[in-house]
């Protein structure tokens, strides 16, 4: 299936040009999306091109500037947040990145009623997290690992927690491992729907081993970065959840929410918190051995001033074939009765589907079914449930938005997006206003992305929010590669692949092949999305064929494929890449003497193992920031898929699945190993150990480190990285410079 046909006609060929590496590094062909910042059922805010903050009313068609670019510029603001009562705006400046989601910033409060910044009781700096209450203009913020509350922006703060300590106790913000591997947020505090209560997590990292690495900087002596980072099998953070009444917080103080007994009996994690009403909250917990999850619904008992979590409101989710959930355990979406909820989990056939839970999980009513997966529940209203799935035309790498009418019986299902712009748009996400009165659809491809606004009742398109016209025009004289998404059937396994082909691809010719791999559990690389990136350039200008393959362990095709890698990472992911390469060779247009593989992070691990597989298939390959042993990676992630590195659990496979154990097998391939020295995520230690093993085995290899760079290798390092990798591949494939 040709998803992005080349627009080359013979008459135009001489005016067309190939992509250059410079195009990619400069972001010449990047696209824009439009996500409305909803502030009511029919209003949203958006930052205009000239940086004014504009309020749009869909129903009146009117718009007005609520905050001028002049005000933004006066404090160098890069972000903003309007208080729900619309009286104040916080302005964020001095952004300073920490880890993947976390950053610190300076915050200024602007009073819209008098057009002045709030003076007196200003916020301290830098702040780790700040947010408005959902109603009114209370502020909660985290400063130096403690939580503070302001009843009004001009009021003095009330300190809620006092035990916060750098790298020891984290209140209202996650520690490293919870941020990266569990919550995927920079915050760990949650307002109740009307702002009566504030829930927060406390993470105690006192006993966690610390990863230490040098940050070279410009000084005479390097700094040492210390991060409490639990590797597989190590001591984990101790988490507690508290709730405080924000009306009179000094009276009762923070109240701890009890952990379900079956969870508290051994090491456990807190996985998410969902407010249902102001006096009902839902917490999700997970055993350290991550195949048992408990959803606990707790109620505020006014007479006792406490949170009660009855056993009758505990719902257990257990996996017998793998770990609980997909990448994370799904979160519930509560219905209007404030007790029943919708949740995605595996059905009896092993496909993740929406279920309706009214009393017990055992009595759950299955809402969607089929040999495809429901992926996200966007919104539940009184009569509709909006969700995304990959059902349409049986392509797992697509995302369409569906509406199920839950107000009628039997419920009827409608695909909202399937036929809107069928060739251009097959991968959608959505953003809903209050009560789903309106919604925005953001299409990511395979054609040029487009964002549109729709009526939540009729699904009618109201207007185009962003169609990337400039990008479309810029691409008119570019020879883009062709893209195909197809599948291979091998030994009862379906391997979906995306192939990126040179513009003048000719099946009778032979092309060098580059496999781009990620392959991590519950990931998906073969997606119907638009991208003009490095591999687009390699196909367009350098005439390579690039393939991405989703093998065992990848997501959205059922539990059989997903959980195949459970407790044995590094085996089937590699096998399936190799199997696919063999199939590609059989297609007749691959030069089997010029095959390479590359990957980043988990992909670096897989590419390293593929190169060291001893198949003789690969001439060369690149591993960027690879994991080299699962004993070196984070407990939460690693143990989810591998269990514990103990003799009585899975130590043997931990040892067998290292890159170092295969050092000898790198002798007959060209290997380029790349890592940032300040990688907080996949520590430089991983590559250091690969290098040591290769040296000890007297195996030649190439390497590049990026001083003071993290897992993302950003900024100028990006340019250097892709230039360096391009040279390496061109040399490997004997392509002239």
């Amino acid at each position: 299936i040709v998803l992005r046909p080349s627009r080359v006609h013979n008459s135009e060929e001489n005016t067309m040009r190939a992509l250059t590496l410079k195009d990619i590094l400069n972001g010449t062909f990047s696209y824009k999306t439009f996500f409305p910042n909803w502030i009511s059922g029919q209003e949203y805010l958006h930052q205009s091109a000239d940086n004014n903050i504009v309020l749009y009313n869909i129903e009146t068609g009117q718009s007005y500037t609520i905050l001028s670019n002049r005000t933004m510029k006066s404090v160098n603001a890069s972000n903003y947040g309007l208080s729900p009562d619309r009286q104040f705006v916080y302005l964020e400046s001095d952004y300073s990145k920490l880890w993947r989601y976390s950053y610190t910033a300076t915050y200024y409060i602007y009073d819209l009623s008098n057009g002045e910044f709030v003076r007196g009781n200003e916020l301290p700096r830098p702040i780790q997290y700040l947010c408005w209450s959902p109603v009114g203009s209370k502020l909660a913020y985290v400063y130096q690992n403690n939580i503070y509350l302001k009843q009004r922006p001009g009021d003095p703060p009330f300190q809620i927690t006092f035990n916060g300590r750098e790298n020891k106790i984290f209140n209202g913000i996650p520690d490293w491992v919870y941020e990266e591997e569990m919550l995927a947020t920079k915050y760990a505090l949650w307002w109740s729907p009307n702002g009566k209560f504030l829930a927060y997590a406390e993470f105690n990292d006192t006993d966690i081993p610390v990863i230490a690495y040098s940050y070279y900087g410009d000084e005479q002596y390097p700094r040492t970065i210390n991060i409490p980072y639990p590797k597989a099998g190590a001591k984990n953070p101790v988490v507690r959840i508290f709730i405080i009444d924000t009306t009179y917080p000094a009276y009762v103080g923070p109240q701890e929410v009890p952990v379900p007994a079956m969870i508290a009996s051994s090491d456990y994690y807190f996985s998410w918190l969902t407010w249902v009403t102001d006096e009902r909250v839902c917490l999700q917990w997970l055993k350290r051995v991550q195949n048992v999850s408990v959803l606990s619904i707790c109620d505020f008992r006014e007479d006792w001033q406490t949170w009660d979590c009855p056993k009758t409101q505990e719902h257990i989710e257990e996996s017998r074939t793998g770990w609980a959930g997909g990448f994370f355990v799904s979160t519930p979406v509560f219905s209007y009765d404030a007790i029943s909820y919708y949740k995605i989990f595996s059905d009896k056939d092993g496909y993740k589907h929406i279920h309706y839970i009214k009393d017990t999980v055992e009595n759950a009513i299955q809402i969607t079914s089929g040999k495809w997966e429901a992926i996200n529940i966007f919104r539940v209203t009184q009569d509709s449930l909006f969700y995304s799935s990959n059902e349409f035309e049986e392509y797992p790498g697509r995302r369409n938005i569906y509406r199920i009418s839950i107000g009628s019986y039997p419920p009827s299902k409608k695909c909202v997006t399937c036929h809107l712009r069928k060739e251009r748009c097959q991968y959608y996400t959505a953003s809903f206003s209050d009560y789903a009165k309106y919604y925005a659809l953001v299409c990511y491809g395979p054609g040029i992305p487009i964002s549109t606004l729709h009526d939540g009742r009729t699904d009618q398109e109201i207007k185009i929010l962003e169609e990337n016209k400039e990008l479309e025009n810029a691409l008119k004289n570019i020879q883009l590669p062709k893209e195909e998404i197809k599948k291979l059937e091998v030994d009862e396994i379906t391997l979906w692949y995306k192939m990126i082909l040179p513009p003048q691809f000719d099946r009778s010719k032979k092309y060098p092949l580059l496999i781009q791999v990620y392959g991590g559990p519950c990931s998906q690389s073969v997606r119907s999305v638009f991208a003009v990136n490095w591999i687009s350039y390699l196909a367009s200008k350098e005439g390579m064929v690039i393939a991405l393959v989703d093998g065992r362990g990848t997501a959205f095709q059922g539990d059989k494929l997903l959980y195949a890698v459970y407790r044995k990472l590094g085996v089937y992911e590699v096998e399936d890449q190799i199997t696919a390469v063999r199939k590609f060779i059989e297609m007749g247009f691959i030069d089997e003497k010029r095959i390479a593989i590359w990957g980043w992070s988990y992909g670096g691990y897989v590419s390293s193992l593929a190169l060291a597989s001893g198949t003789g298939l690969f001439k060369c390959g690149i591993a960027v920031a690879p994991v080299s042993s699962w004993e070196y990676y984070a407990s939460v992630y690693t143990e989810r898929f591998m269990g514990l590195p103990t003799k009585d659990d899975n130590l043997e496979h931990y040892k067998n699945s290292t890159v170092m154990a295969r050092a000898e097998y790198f002798r007959n391939v060209d290997y380029l190993l790349i890592h940032g020295t300040a990688d907080d995520n996949v520590h430089f230690q991983n590559s250091a150990q690969i290098a040591k093993a290769l040296v000890n085995a007297q195996v030649d290899f190439q390497a590049m480190w990026y001083s003071d760079q993290n897992h993302g290798l950003s900024g100028l390092s990006t340019n250097h990285l892709y230039t360096h990798m391009t040279h390496f591949l061109k040399q490997c494939f004997s392509l002239s410079d």
């Epitope: 007196g120 302001k150 006792w304």
Partner: antibody, heavy 117, light 108 residues
Amino acid sequence: EVQLLESGGGLVQPGGSLRLSCAASGFTFSSYAMSWVRQAPGKGLEWVSAIGVSTGSTYYADSVKGRFTISRDNSKNTLYLQMNSLRAEDTAVYYCAKGWLGPFDYWGQGTLVTVSS
Amino acid sequence: EIVLTQSPGTLSLSPGERATLSCRASQSVSSSYLAWYQQKPGQAPRLLIYGASSRATGIPDRFSGSGSGTDFTLTISRLEPEDFAVYYCQQGQLIPPTFGQGTKVEIK
């Protein structure tokens, strides 16, 4: 009906120790933060210490930090104040009060601590 | 710490009269964290007002509180014989919580 009953006061020499107790009834003791507030003879009220619902959270006035220890036994519905290294200026009526940092909505009748040689 | 200064130190009034007691904070206090107490000789303090203006359970409506920032007021609209006592304001905004030195309302 909420009741707080302090005990354990008395005469003690400077440098000595005393342990005050406060027996609570009429409410779910384990769900509330509790405090000790004292009043020197003929003087005003001074907050001494508080303990949160979770026993790990304790707070002290600078004047008693390192000498006094607040604790609670939820199974016995009792609040304690262990007072060591007592000084003459610790002489006061000690009240047990329901609440964290305020408001304190219920108070005990108080127990007199006299530090004198 | 926040210092609360009450004035006047003593207020001499007759039953039936209006009493206005002032409490000034050394730094801003959010109204949620200000309370007033009444104490009679030989007795424990009793909570009258919390959140600067909310009456505690069982407190007659002749007692009212107001104010914000650094200035707070307790008003007794018509003094009853049982109202003659010492009144304290208290803040819970910052640790340590602090009390004013008290205002004594005595019979004239």
